[in-house]
Structure formats: C-alpha cells, structure tokens
Interface confidence: medium
C-alpha cells in the first residue's frame, strides 16, 4: 500500500452563472479529496493541481499551494474549487443548461487532480481521474459520492 493515499470523494457543490449575450456558462465546482498519511511522521501537502474536462476539452484549471500538514497515521479532507467556463465552440450547451422544460441538467465532466506531497526529502505526485455528473442548470449541493458517473471509462480506485 502507498504511504500516502489520495481518494477523490466527489463533487461537493456546483454554483452556476450565465452570460446571456455570450451564451456562456460559468460553473464553480468544489470537489472533496481525502488524503491519508500512513507514515509515522508528518507529511506536507505541497500543492494540489486540478483540471476539469468536458467532451475532451479542458474547461477549467486550479492550483492550491502550501495546503496543510498531515500528522502520522492521520487523514485530512480537503476541498478545492475549480472555476470552469463552457463557451465558444461549446456554447450549444447553453441551450441545454438553461432549458426550463427539464428539471435536472446533468452533464458529464472529467475531474483530474494531482496531489504533491513532500516527505523524507522527496516529493511524490499522486493523480486521480473521475467522471462526475454536474447539474449545469442550477446551484447544487451534493451528498459526497452522489455525483459519481459510473461508466466503463471510469478508472478503477
């Protein structure tokens, strides 16, 4: 087993706004990670880099630095937010996301995250990829794990 375990838990919330003129959707997506330190010494979570893809196009990126220190045999839950923009060649999605006749406007996004930890004099990078449902039609708060998109493309834990 890894001495550092990173588990992508899921989307915590998604807040939506629109630019009617530009037919653009802005989605602020907050994700949750569990990082477990299985060592007998503290490790530093140096940075988290994340990106979100829709239909194989990167629609948002984020980076957090100097995040936290995790004690021996301890776990921390970390939330990080990725601002995303669905626009231009994907502006056709604006019609779907603002359609009043349907209640839930779920789109499938691919969440990619890389956690860099430092300990014992070296850095270790651990990456995760998950497909998630996000409602682009309203502000939504999710139960952890509720937004998971189970699909053959979904990488195994």
């Amino acid at each position: 087993p890894r001495s550092i375990d990173v588990k992508y838990i899921g989307v915590k919330s998604a807040y939506v706004s629109y630019d009617v003129q530009k037919r653009t959707i802005y989605l602020n997506i907050t994700n949750t990670l569990n990082i477990t330190n299985n060592n007998y010494y503290s490790v530093e979570v140096e940075n988290i880099t994340a990106q979100v893809q829709f239909s194989k196009t990167v629609i948002g990126k984020a980076r957090l630095n100097n995040i936290t220190i995790i004690g021996p045999l301890d776990m921390k839950q970390i939330d990080y937010t990725v601002p995303t923009v669905i626009a231009e060649e994907m502006s056709y999605m604006y019609d779907f996301c603002t359609l009043i006749s349907i209640k839930v406007h779920n789109i499938v996004l691919m969440m990619q995250v890389t956690v860099t930890t430092t300990y014992f004099g070296h850095s270790e990078q651990i990456s995760q990829e998950r497909y998630q449902y996000v409602d682009c039609g309203r502000n939504t708060t999710y139960q952890l794990g509720q937004s998971e998109y189970l699909n053959v493309l979904q990488p195994q834990q």
Partner: antibody, heavy 120, light 112 residues
C-alpha cells in the same frame, strides 16, 4: 499521572476470538498513538501494530494482519485489540503502550499486560 | 521490513561492571527531519517493559544516569556504567522510524 489500564487475563478456546482493552488516563488520548506488543514465554517482544485514536488509522506488522484488529473509542479513551481465530501460538502477554506524535518518544508508558491463554 | 540485530544475546555480569549492548539496523533510522526513532527498553519478568532511552541518547524521566545511549544511522549502543541488581532482565532496542516498527531480539543481562 499517565496510566494505561488493561483488561484482565483471558482463558479462550481455540478458534474463537478475544478483545483486549487498554483504558488511557492522565493525558489527552487523541494526542498520542497506541502501540500493541506481544510477549511469549522464552521469546522476545513482537510489535503487532499501532493506531492513531484520533483518526482511527492503523498500521500493522504484516504477520498480524488478519489476526489482530485495532480500534479506539475516543469517548471512553479506550483502545482495543481483537484477536481472531485463536490458536496456541496466540497464547501470550499482550501490552499496550503510548507513543508521542511529535517527539521521538516511542512507547513511553505501558499497560500492565493482559495474559491470553488459548486452551481447549 | 527493517531487520534489527542485537548483540550479545546473553551478557553475564557482576554487580559494579560496565557493559555495552549493541543494536544494528539493516537501514538508516534517521528520517528526513533528522529524527532517529531508536529506543531502549528493560523488561523484567512479570512486569511491563520500561523505556530507558529514546531518540538514541535521551534518558526517559526517572531513568538513572548510569544508562546512556549513543550511535547514529544504523549502529547504536546502550551503556550501563555500574550494574546494580535492579538492572537485571531483558534489554530490547526498537526502531520506530520505518514501517513496521521492529524490536531487536533482546539481550539477557544476568549475574555471572
């Protein structure tokens, strides 16, 4: 003062399981790790595993994986070790001890030990 | 796993003697932060093990100054300057740096 009070001696039938307790007092329970150690007559000390009572995260000696299960109850400041599928090889004295998170102090205070005898 | 080799297995002594017990690990016990988790314990029959030395050379509270620890990296020594009757028993070193923690095989300090 720091004390680790362990449960009493156990006489157990082979194939069954036993749960040994270790009640901590005199310090902040979740600020220290709890270690478990085995001592058989005529043999040396054997490290079983360790638990962080605050997070519940454990680390085991490979030899004791599937044999020992470590848990902790923060509300009662008590750590537990369950031993399953007992055989005569599990007859031993089992000790709990605490270790400091931050300093290099490993197993500074120890429980009095719990004797487990496996016999039919 | 880290192998911790303790020598000698048995140490016959007379009261007043000075003795050394050696502990050697298969890998360095110093971590990135410069900490070395190497402890020494005395275990007497019918009692709980008692911590004597931690972090190579730090005496635990209440431990007499006739006990001293030294060493670095992979080689460590426990010295007892003047043996007293209460010092008889099994001595163990423990490495706590790497997973899993491992004890040395023990050294029996007994009267000649």
């Amino acid at each position: 003062q720091v004390q680790l009070q362990q449960s009493g001696a156990e006489l157990i039938r082979p194939g069954t399981s036993v749960k040994v307790s270790c009640k901590a007092s005199g310090y902040a329970f979740t600020n220290y790790l709890i270690e478990w150690v085995k001592k058989r007559p005529g043999q040396g000390l054997e490290w079983i595993g360790v638990i962080n009572p605050g997070s519940g995260i454990t680390n085991y000696n490979e030899k004791f994986k599937g044999k020992a299960t470590l848990t902790a109850d923060k509300s009662s400041s008590t750590a537990y070790m369950q031993l399953s599928s007992l055989t005569s090889e599990d007859s031993a004295v089992y000790f709990c001890a605490r270790s400091d998170f931050i300093t290099t102090v490993v197993a500074d205070y120890w429980g009095q030990g719990t004797t487990v005898t496996v016999s039919s | 796993d880290i192998v911790v080799t303790q020598t000698p297995l048995s140490l016959p002594v007379s009261f007043g003697d000075q003795v050394s017990i050696s502990c050697r690990s298969s890998q360095s016990l110093t971590n990135y932060y410069g900490n070395t988790y190497l402890s020494w314990y005395l275990h007497k029959p019918g009692q709980s093990p008692q911590l004597l030395i931690y972090g190579i050379s730090n005496r635990f509270s209440g431990v007499p100054d006739r006990f001293s620890g030294s060493g670095s990296g992979t080689d460590f020594t426990l010295k007892i300057s003047t043996i007293k009757p209460e010092d008889l028993g099994m001595y163990y070193c423990l490495q706590g740096t790497h997973q899993p923690r491992t004890f040395g095989g023990g050294t029996k300090l007994e009267i000649k």
